[in-house]
């Protein structure tokens, strides 16, 4: 119901279609929604390794 045909991009691919400010891209249904509707991964403790890179989930500048 939510995975229509789409190209599979490489790891250096651009972000999905930009969302308006205050919206984030819901990777599970592939569309923009209010950021408050999504739950991000738990923050890493201070000093933890491998900080998460900026993702398509964050509001677009």
């Amino acid at each position: 119901m939510r995975r229509g045909p789409r190209s599979l991009r490489g790891r250096d691919a651009p972000a999905p279609t930009p969302c308006v400010p205050a919206e984030c891209f819901d990777l599970l249904v592939r569309h923009c929604v209010a950021c408050g509707l999504l739950r991000a991964p738990r923050p890493k403790p201070a000093g933890a390794s491998s900080p998460a890179p900026r993702t398509a989930l964050q509001p677009q500048e």
């Epitope: 599979l8 991009r9 691919a13 990777l27 509707l37 999504l38 739950r39 991964p41």
Partner: antibody, heavy 117, light 111 residues
Framework: EVQLQESGPSLVKPSQTLSLTCSVT????????WNWIRKFPGNKLEFMGY???????YYNPSLKSRISITRDTSKNQYYLQLNSVTTEDTATYYC???????????WGQGTTLTVSA | DIVLTQSPVSLAVSLGQRATISCRAS??????????MHWYQQKPGQPPKLLIY???DLESGIPARFSGSGSGTDFTLTINPVETDDVAIYYC?????????FGGGTKLEIK
């Protein structure tokens, strides 16, 4: 911290309907995704489906004709209904919630269901 | 459905040594530059516990002895060094395409 707790019967007879409840504290079910997963004897895990922030549901096609997931936002609970159960539905049933990548970081303790006459 | 094949089915490792578990997907689980592959640990009587998400990101509170790697169709969970507390079944899971699916599990034991 999000906490989930399953409740429901431990024994159901074949052909009956299974109804389970997942009670959520620490977050609102009007945000995020709220899943049902089961683990069969023999350790196979199966994703059954979800209901999300908008009330949209997705059901595993292997169950589609028998499954329904609903919610009551006023109680912050969501529900699993599985019709026409057979002994093949004997499993431990978990509710869980994933973060943005679909990885499930909060789980209930699970409820064990036996389907037997 | 995307089929996830884990190997080995069971694994016995000496304390302090490295354990490596493989998960191969029947098709790519990458999209938007993200690998939608996750790893869980499950002990008897407990629900699965998230260890690694997005192929290589360590879940908060999980020891750095656990690491994940891979992209596309081939993924690896590494535990180094193995400790007694690591005895469990380990599962991979993909959330790239519906329905989300799990691997068959790898049982880790101490030699």
């Amino acid at each position: 911290e999000v906490q989930l707790q399953e409740s429901g019967p431990s024994l159901v007879k074949p052909s009956q309907t299974l109804s389970l409840t997942c009670s959520v504290t620490g977050d609102s079910i009007t945000r995020g995704y709220w899943n049902w997963i089961r683990k069969f004897p023999g350790n196979k895990l199966e994703f059954m489906g979800y209901i999300n922030y908008s009330g949209t549901t997705y059901y595993n096609p292997s169950l589609k004709s028998r499954i329904s997931i609903t919610r009551d936002t006023s109680k912050n609970q969501y529900y699993l209904q599985l019709n026409s159960v057979t002994t093949e539905d004997t499993a431990t049933y978990y509710c869980a919630t994933p973060h943005t990548y679909g990885a499930m970081d909060y789980w209930g303790q699970g409820t064990t269901l036996t389907v037997s006459a | 459905d995307i089929v996830l094949t884990q190997s080995p089915v069971s694994l016995a490792v000496s304390l302090g040594q490295r354990a490596t578990i493989s998960c191969r997907a029947s098709e790519s689980v990458d999209d938007y530059g993200i690998s939608f592959m996750h790893w869980y640990q499950q002990k008897p009587g407990q629900p699965p516990k998230l260890l690694i998400y997005r192929a290589s990101d360590l879940e908060s509170g999980i020891p750095a002895r656990f690491s994940g790697s891979g992209s596309g169709t081939d993924f690896t969970l590494t535990i180094n060094p193995v400790e007694t507390d690591d005895v469990a079944i380990y599962y991979c899971q993909q959330t790239s395409k519906d329905p989300w699916t799990f691997g068959g599990g790898t049982k880790l034991e101490i030699k």
